[in-house]
């Protein structure tokens, strides 16, 4: 099929950074300033993205590949290709509606952002809470007696972190 | 506005050599495939050679290991190169700008007003 539609569309040869400009008889074109094509045989060029407010420039737009965003200080990357930028919070706080609020007691939040996450429930492996937690670190579980015989000593790190924005299972 | 301009031609015994040179403007030249066709007396015009942006080249089987095209994106020009002249190459030459880039089946844009090339003893 490919092979057919190239020996049928007198455009599939036109280079990336170019474009197959009906206006002028079907010869190749280059994009426009501010446009860009980044595969062969295009009938059209797409306009650049512009990275303007609370975005800022993380790769100019060339003839053959769109303009890369990232977001301001005090902001972060949302969705594919950064798509929207949401506020930072400090540790321990997570994004509402109304804006930053405090990890309610029992949640934590050891990023900028994402929600607040329960702590570790020690209990569940039969562990006793050897660090307590806080607004911006999960609890340290301790071993539990059973673990204490002589020579054996233990501290069960924090479970990893899950992904930002991810609410837990 | 798309020109081409053709130059080059004459007169010359068989076996004899020509250079035909084309020299293009009002367009992009350096990413379009440009072509060198022919007409003879009393004959349909036909393919002789083009050539890509990529510098692929492409020719009719009847010229094949006598006439080189090439080109300059530098000077926007496109060359054909004819050696080993026979009686049967005499023609009006004509470049062509392709469509799309493309030098399987071809298809032209935009024509030269041609350069006449007589192969005699």
């Known amino acids: 099929f490919e092979r057919t539609r190239s020996l049928q569309d007198p455009c599939s040869n036109c280079p990336a950074g170019t474009f197959c400009d009906n206006n002028r008889n079907q010869i190749c074109s280059p994009c426009p300033p501010n446009s860009f094509s980044s595969a062969g045989g295009q009938r059209t060029c797409d306009i650049c993205r512009q990275c303007k407010g609370v975005f800022r420039t993380r790769k100019e737009c060339s003839s053959t590949s769109n303009a890369e965003c990232d977001c301001t200080p005090g902001f972060h990357c949302l969705g594919a290709g950064c798509s929207m930028c949401e506020q930072d919070c400090k540790q321990g706080q997570e994004l509402t509606k109304k804006g930053c609020k405090d990890c309610c007691f029992g949640t934590f939040n050891d990023q900028k952002r994402g929600i607040c996450r329960p702590w570790t429930n020690c209990s569940l492996d039969g562990k006793s809470v050897l660090v307590n937690g806080t607004k911006e670190r999960d609890v340290v579980c301790g071993p539990s007696p059973a673990d204490l015989s002589p020579g054996a000593s233990s501290v069960t790190p924090p479970a990893p972190a899950r992904e930002p924005g991810h609410s837990p299972q | 506005e798309v020109q081409l301009l053709e130059s080059g031609g004459g007169e010359v015994q068989p076996g004899g050599s020509l250079r035909l040179s084309c020299a293009a403007s009002?367009?992009?030249?350096?990413?379009?495939?440009m072509g060198w066709y022919r007409q003879a007396p009393g004959k349909r015009r036909e393919f002789v050679a083009a050539i890509e942006s990529s510098r692929n080249t492409v020719y009719a089987e009847s010229v094949k290991g006598r006439f080189t095209i090439s080109r300059d994106n530098a000077k926007n020009t496109v060359y054909l190169q004819m050696s080993s002249l026979r009686a049967e190459d005499t023609a009006v030459y004509y470049c062509?700008?392709?469509?799309?880039?493309?030098?399987?089946?071809?298809?032209?844009?935009?024509w030269g007003q041609g350069t006449l090339v007589t192969v005699k003893p």
């Open positions: 009002g367009f992009s030249f350096s990413i379009n495939a």
């Open positions: 062509g700008l392709l469509k799309g880039n493309r030098v399987v089946s071809p298809s032209v844009a935009y």
